[in-house]
């Protein structure tokens, strides 16, 4: 079960995993979220009381029965991993820690005007994994403004002090704000010869990437194959590391193939969810249980209810044994690898998906692939909205997009005329107008938040989010889409698709089914020729064919600009404006949310 | 120290070539990565191609994909920029620079070129 509210005065006896550092209780049950065995944690405020060595101490711990003895002391608070909740986690952590001095190995010292400076110095070098930042009023001149940036081999600080005018705080990397590259591809045939700084079993190079990528202390990796010729060596994940962050060489290899992190990319990423599943493959590890399955599916499901489950691997049932069921083992290791790999045995193998949420819910797949569009089929599109209004009779309004469990990102101009969120009706997960009745459930909306620059569509700033009364529970037909990150402001996107309920021409009615429509990106040079009369701006972004035919129309209004890049579906536009409806040399006009996502994260994150 | 002197740029019509180069000199095995940033009149710096010096790893920002190449001559430290298929919106002043990070942060990179102005006209 989930349980979310920290325990104050209270130490959990027993269980120790390790022990570690961390500035606040809400850290340390994030680092407890993300340890591969910790369900439950103790961490040790400041206090009069305790020993000052113990002060920030953040002890990991697990227990068989999921819980631990409770024992009153003052100035512990204790709590419970994040592993038992199905709400999304993140470890990105923007907290500024004052009169904190967070210890590490100090690697790089240098002059900053800030602690923000310092921070983003931090998020764009490659090893800083925290920093300590002197202010003006600190008492030694020499160090005044001095930005130290640390690493450690956990990631996490060895020691945490009390020190007058310095603040401490986190590398923002796990944010996805870096500017560092980021190199995604996978180098066949090839060894980096660098330092190991750990290794481990993976059944593929993408499990070992992934491994790497939220590994503290991994820049790049080396995986061996299943048919490396040393068989000790096979499907060994090695993570490396070296002074200048890069491979100082690559030696060509055959069977082995190398990467590198990922923990630097500014777009989203699947990187905790290992989805699947290893056929002939048999994972080894410390067993948990053995439970009777249908299904090599099945054994996945029972494997992430299990909380303390890691992977698992199935062996179908021999022809008419026990109905049919096969069995599931259900393992664990202390890193959350299996100890050792094994092929040709018959077994399917794969991993928990309870990790899958911790990577952002908008990054996992989604079923494979609008005047001129096409029908589209139930599940492609799960981010899109349809949102009616119930006055004077219901109707569909406009389009909308799930980008969070409780907010929908919009168009503007839907409201024009709307009194009052009370009138309006979010329907999710849904591909036919008709399928909407009477008793069909909806999402009402608690608050209308329109850009207070917005004026009229055309002028810009027509982007509008809902708040919804009532959180969304992701499924596979209605789960939110990623917002671009401002990071990615010179990817250019091929693979876009405009979606929506509206006019198919421009004299017709709302469509029944949700159509789709491939349309490219047009240049704001191209598209400010083609509006001569209005003045198309960086905060705009346009799309359509110059021979006109497939375009946003009526109705479509608020809806997506949806493009696939790296295999994830981004949020490009909001449907906005155009002359007419997919006429020749017309593109739509669409909202450039890139450009507003700050806006989106100030709104949606105020407390 | 490390000095850094760019040349090759000019003017050139939409759908020509040009080739710059970046020679460097001094304390030069310090540096892990090389870059070319541009500056548009108006507009931020930003990273057009990295490459990082010993391994040779390679990344360009999306708008020039399959039409600048970055490459390097070891034996002259010098980094070259091959860029083909010029359009409009590439007319800019390019900077070479060097620094110990594999990054698009112009911060990142201690030493910089004094620039050379490429113009495509269309």
């Known amino acids: 079960e989930c349980v979310t509210q920290l325990l104050k005065d209270t130490c959990f006896e027993g269980g120790d995993i390790t022990t570690v550092f961390t500035p606040s209780a809400k850290y340390c049950q994030v680092v407890c979220t993300y340890h591969p065995r910790c369900l439950l944690f103790t961490f040790t405020a400041e206090s009069p009381s305790e020993d000052p060595t113990r002060w920030f101490t953040c002890v990991l711990k697990d227990s068989v029965t999921e819980t631990l003895p409770r024992v009153n002391r003052t100035a512990a608070i204790s709590g419970y991993s994040f592993k038992q909740c199905s709400h999304q986690i993140s470890a990105c952590n923007k907290d500024i820690y004052v009169d904190l001095d967070m210890k590490g190995i100090n690697y790089n010292s240098s002059v900053a005007k800030s602690a923000q400076e310092c921070q983003e110095r931090c998020t764009d070098d490659v090893h800083c994994h925290f920093f300590t930042y002197a202010t003006r009023q600190f008492p030694s001149l020499e160090h005044r403004n001095i930005c130290l940036l640390k690493h450690t081999q956990t990631g996490t600080p060895t020691r945490i002090t009390k020190l007058d005018k310095v603040v401490s705080g986190f590398s923002l990397k796990s944010c996805a704000l870096s500017n560092l590259a980021c190199i995604r591809d996978i180098f066949p045939n090839t060894v980096f010869a660098d330092s190991n700084i750990d290794s481990v079993m993976a059944p593929d190079a993408f499990v070992c990437g992934r491994i790497c990528t939220h590994h503290p202390g991994c820049l790049f990796f080396t995986f061996f194959s299943q048919e490396w010729p040393k068989e000790s060596q096979r499907n060994l994940c090695l993570l490396k590391t070296s002074e200048s962050g890069l491979p100082s060489t690559r030696i060509k290899k055959s069977k082995a193939l190398s990467g590198f992190s990922l923990q630097s990319c500014r777009h989203s990423i699947p990187v905790f969810c290992h989805s699947s599943f290893y056929h002939d493959t048999d994972f080894l590890g410390e067993e948990l249980d053995i439970v009777a399955a249908k299904s090599h599916e099945a054994c996945q499901k029972l494997c992430t209810n299990a909380v303390r489950c890691q992977f698992f691997t199935y062996t179908p049932a021999q022809a008419s044994c026990n109905e049919g069921k096969g069995k599931c083992y259900l393992k664990l290791s202390s890193n959350g690898s299996p100890t050792k790999i094994l092929h040709g045995r018959g077994g399917i193998s794969g991993y928990t998906l309870r990790l899958c949420k911790m990577d952002n819910e908008c990054t996992t797949k989604i079923k494979p692939r609008i005047v001129g569009g096409t029908a589209s089929v139930r599940g492609e599109w799960p981010w899109q909205v349809t949102l009616h209004t119930t006055s004077p009779t219901q109707r569909h309004l406009c389009g909308g997009s799930i980008i969070g469990n409780q907010w929908i990102l919009t168009a503007a101009h839907c409201f024009y005329g709307v009194e009052s969120p009370k009138i309006l009706r979010v329907y999710s997960g849904i591909l036919n107008q008709s399928e909407i009745k009477e008793d069909t459930s909806f999402f009402g909306v608690q608050e209308i938040i329109i850009h207070d620059q917005y004026k009229m569509a055309e002028s810009g700033y027509d982007i509008a989010l809902l708040k919804l009364e009532t959180t969304v529970n992701y499924t596979d037909s209605q789960r939110p889409i990623c917002l671009p990150s401002k990071g990615d402001r010179n990817v250019i996107y091929t693979d876009c698709w405009v979606t929506g309920w509206g006019y198919r021409k421009l004299r017709d009615k709302i469509q029944n089914t949700l159509q789709k429509a491939k349309i490219p990106l047009v240049t704001n040079e191209e598209c400010q020729k083609r509006y001569r009369g209005h003045k198309i701006t960086h905060k705009m972004i346009c799309a359509g064919y110059r021979e006109g035919g497939k375009d946003a129309c009526k109705g479509d209004s608020g809806g997506p600009l949806s493009c696939k890049h790296n295999e994830v579906w981004h949020l490009v536009g909001i449907t906005s404006w155009g002359e007419g409806c997919a006429q020749r040399e017309r593109p739509g006009v669409y909202t450039n949310v890139v450009e507003y996502v700050d806006w989106i994260l100030e709104k949606t994150q105020a407390v | 120290q490390v000095q850094l002197v760019e040349s090759g740029g000019g003017s050139v019509q939409a759908g020509g070539s040009l080739r710059l180069s970046c020679a460097a000199s001094?304390?030069?095995?310090?540096?892990?990565?090389m870059a070319w940033f541009r500056q548009a009149p108006g507009k931020e710096r930003e990273g057009v191609a990295l490459?990082?010096?010993?391994?040779?790893?390679?990344s360009y920002t999306d708008s020039v994909k399959g039409r600048f190449t970055i490459s390097q001559d070891n034996s002259k430290n010098t980094v070259y920029l091959q860029m083909n298929s010029l359009r409009a919106e590439d007319t800019a002043v390019y900077y070479c620079?060097?620094?110990?990070?594999?990054?698009?942060?112009?911060?990142?990179?201690?030493?910089w070129g004094q620039g050379t102005l490429v113009t495509v006209s269309s």
């Open positions: 620079a060097a620094g110990t990070q594999f990054s698009w942060s112009p911060g990142s990179y201690n030493y």
């Open positions: 001094g304390y030069t095995y310090s540096m892990g990565a």
């Open positions: 490459i990082a010096t010993s391994s040779g790893f390679i």
